[in-house]
Amino acid sequence: IFKKEQAMCLEKIQRANELMGFNDSSPGCPGMWDNITCWKPAHVGEMVLVSCPELFRIFNPDQVWETETIGESDFGDSNSLDLSDMGVVSRNCTEDGWSEPFPHYFDACGFDEYESET
């Protein structure tokens, strides 16, 4: 599942780079797959929000929130996400690159990075 998600993510990032005019020398944070979910490219100072991936609901059937589905806009309407929602993780794009996810996946989603590798 994760290999397929990763491949889809890289495609989305490529399309987003073209739309945003991003290239390797552009300031900001490149889109990335972090072994759990897909992060769109971002400008310095931008905070990006993602929902706990649907996969987590397979492992955690008690989880009751609705996760953001990736729509036709590749990365979904991330503007509709809010840190006041449960199951939302953020990263800040800084001059030094992406910040660590906050909260950590384990605490926001009940799922660890290491689980996605097995």
């Epitope: 955690n60 008690d62 989880q63 006041s84 929602d85 950590h104 660890d112 290491y114 689980e115 097995t118």
Partner: antibody, heavy 123, light 107 residues
Amino acid sequence: QVQLQQSGPGLVKPSQTLSLTCAISGDSVSSNSATWNWIRQSPSRGLEWLGRTYYRSKWSNHYAVSVKSRITINPDTSKSQFSLQLNSVTPEDTAVYYCARGTWKQLWFLDHWGQGTLVTVSS
Amino acid sequence: DIQMTQSPSSLSASVGDRITITCRASQSISRYLNWYQQKPGKAPKLLIYAASSLQSGIPSRFSGSGSGTDFTLTINSLQPEDFATYFCQQSYSPPFTFGQGTKVDIK
């Protein structure tokens, strides 16, 4: 029925190491759906989460910054228990120490607790 | 660290009363909030998780609400066994901090 049974000395001398063990029955320390936590309680500091260990294809630990340089939480899979070691204790570490299981259901919560062990740090 | 502040620190009430305890987080924690009850000499006991979900086996007179930074625990029709100390706890981000407690005693 999950039960946590704590053991360890109630008196520790300053500068020495506090060691407590939490034996798990009705669950496994290697469970891939639980976390295993230590919390302490004192009149001056209230309830204070110290750290946790858990297994998700590898062992991980998270510790409170206030004790990070002195604390170790170790699982013992052969006995299905986990332990707390707190080094270089001072009288401020005097507290009731609890072990607890963390369970996930929308978030992490502590649903089963040990009986508590009063540890006094004194010479 | 996220600071959790409870109020009041103590309250006196009678059997049958409806009481409300509040908990405020120093930053938004969504609904990553739990409530515990503790009696003297005993370990804390989980009452409410995710701000408003009742833990299995807990009487329905206990209820929780809130989101973001402000949360409440309500006990409808206080029973003799409810006289205890109540703590809120955030599990949004480690370290998982607790409020200082609210002691409910008999008026």
